[in-house]
Interface confidence: medium
């Protein structure tokens, strides 16, 4: 912490300007009024203070606002935001999307830091839900943002926000997250026609149930193998050979290359070998002809 010393004669800051970069730390502490700093925060970002000098400026703001900074100051923190701890940020009440954008811009190009994660958490909790504009902003800065949320947090995403989601935003989502997002996407895109609907829903299909995959197989969608491989195994297993053939269209040939990987491997084990043979791909491992298949799960459900 900087010692309290009197400001030398003639050095009292009348405004926040570039001449202050030549002030020693103790001079900044003694000669810059915290209230002046707060009202002229927008200037700080355009002045290349060293990070040791920024420590002094932060200290002054902390003394002025022990309960947390007002949004008028937060919006103009600029590089000073990088000095904030998650504990500092938990004291803030950030409601403006412009403030959020301004602070995310400072951290642009870096990994999501604990400070940014705390900021986003405060912002979203303050809004009550993850609306479309917020999601638009967050995924623009952090494509993986959506997949960093828990299924419980994702449940607060309104279907209307799904329009903001790009395929790359879902790259790191696991099946539990897609289970939550898929029904929202289905609802959001329900009024689109067949081919347009498939383009939009494709990224979310890792959360689709069997009945929806069966319905898609009737629509000539030509699903690519990469999408098929991300489907839930339990949703793929009940599909017939004919349904998978219709679902994949010309991409069905790709099954051969994936026959040792889930969900293709598990699906093959559930199909009759003679049905698999109709594909002409040389897929092996199906149920031999003449064997009876008992669906025990169905029997348990009936008893």
């Amino acid at each position: 912490e900087v010692e309290k010393t009197a400001c030398p004669s003639g050095k009292k800051a009348r405004e926040i300007d570039e001449s202050l970069i030549f002030y020693k730390k103790w001079e900044l502490e003694a000669c810059v009024d915290a209230a002046l700093l707060a009202t002229q925060m927008d200037r700080v970002n355009a002045i290349p203070f060293t990070y040791e000098q920024l420590d002094v400026l932060k200290h002054k703001l902390d003394e002025l606002y022990p309960q947390g900074y007002p949004e008028s100051v937060i919006q103009h923190l600029g590089y000073l935001f990088l000095k904030m701890s998650p504990e500092d940020i938990r004291k803030w009440n950030v409601t403006s999307l412009e403030t959020l954008k301004a602070l995310l811009e400072v951290n642009k190009g870096h990994e999501m830091s604990p400070q940014v994660a705390t900021l986003i958490d405060r912002f979203v909790k303050g809004r009550g839900q993850l609306d479309k504009d917020t999601l638009d902003t967050l995924t623009a800065f952090y494509p993986g943002y959506l997949c960093s949320l828990s299924p419980e947090e994702l449940s607060s995403v309104p279907p209307s926000s799904i329009w903001a989601v790009r395929p790359q935003d879902l790259d790191t989502c696991d099946p539990r997250q897609l289970d939550v997002l898929y029904p929202k996407a289905r609802l959001a895109f329900q009024n689109m026609n067949g081919s347009e609907y498939f383009v939009k829903i494709q990224s979310f299909l890792g959360g689709a149930p069997t009945e929806d995959l069966k319905a898609l197989s009737q629509q000539n969608v030509s699903m690519d193998l990469a999408t098929f491989m991300k489907l839930r195994t339990d949703a793929v297993l009940p599909l017939t050979v004919a349904e998978v053939q219709k679902l994949l269209g010309p991409h069905v040939e790709g099954l051969k290359a994936e026959e040792r990987h889930r969900p293709v491997r598990d699906w093959i084990l559930r199909q009759r070998q003679d049905d698999l043979d109709t594909l002409g791909l040389g897929l092996q491992g199906g149920i031999p002809n003449g064997y009876l298949v008992l669906d025990l799960s169905m029997q348990e459900a009936l008893s």
Epitope: E52, K83, H110, S113
Partner: antibody
């Protein structure tokens, strides 16, 4: 990748001026301050000053205030330093360098290729 | 202005040596010090920032230490490609200042 390209040499007469360029590529020019540093043979480096490409703001080492003038051209992602009233003392290699800052660090991460200025009649 | 001093202008070394280069600041600069390497005819290259953080891609034989006024750059296993000038720089306050540098030479 990030590069700062400078002309190799400038031969100038005493009393004349020279304008050195530093062309940036591989990053958003307006997002980083550009600094200029002087290096004379057998001597240490001296910080001349810096410019803020986003708004043209500048700061100078007191020693170079009447010697150097820093400008930027955003459209060509180029920083310039004009040196005036040249004497043999100004013969040196001049570097531009990009200044990066984060939460608890700052440094010159990329240096220009350097321009050798020779003042001779 | 803060004066940075590297008292040893030259140091003789051999491959495999452990080399320590000392840098002193005229006043407390915290950890706001960087170390650079410069080979003849080339631009400086960043090795260490914030006194002890190795920059991306820098071999781990280079380490930085110190805070306040005394700083050290150590090369734990000297290699022939490490023959160069090394200088420290402070960025605690303006004007930014550099030490004169230490040139490593082969014995």
């Amino acid at each position: 990748q990030v590069q700062l390209q400078q002309p190799g040499t400038e031969l100038v007469k005493p009393g004349a001026s020279v304008k050195l360029s530093c062309k940036a590529s591989g990053y958003t020019f307006t997002s980083y301050w550009m600094h200029w540093v002087k290096q004379r043979p057998g001597q240490g480096l001296e910080w001349i000053g810096h410019s803020n490409p986003s708004n043209g703001g500048t700061n100078y080492n007191e020693k170079f205030k009447s010697k150097a003038t820093l400008t930027v051209d955003k459209s060509s992602s180029t920083a310039y330093m004009q040196l005036s009233s040249l004497t043999s003392e100004d013969s040196a290699v001049y570097y531009c360098a990009r200044w990066v800052r984060g939460s608890n660090y700052e440094y010159f991460d990329v240096w220009g290729t350097g321009t050798t200025v020779t003042v001779s009649s | 202005d803060i004066v940075m001093t590297q008292s040893q202008k030259f140091m003789s070394t051999t491959v495999g040596d452990r080399v320590s280069i000392i840098c002193k600041a005229s006043q407390n600069v915290g950890s706001a010090v960087a170390w650079c390497q410069q080979k003849p005819g080339q631009s400086p290259k960043l090795l260490i920032y914030s006194a002890s953080n190795r920059y991306t891609g820098v071999p781990d034989r280079f380490t930085g230490s110190g805070s306040g006024t005394d700083f050290t750059l150590t090369i734990s296993n000297m290699q022939s490609e490490d023959l160069a000038d090394y200088f420290c720089q402070q960025y605690s306050s303006y004007p930014l200042t550099f030490a004169g540098g230490t040139k490593l030479e082969i014995k």
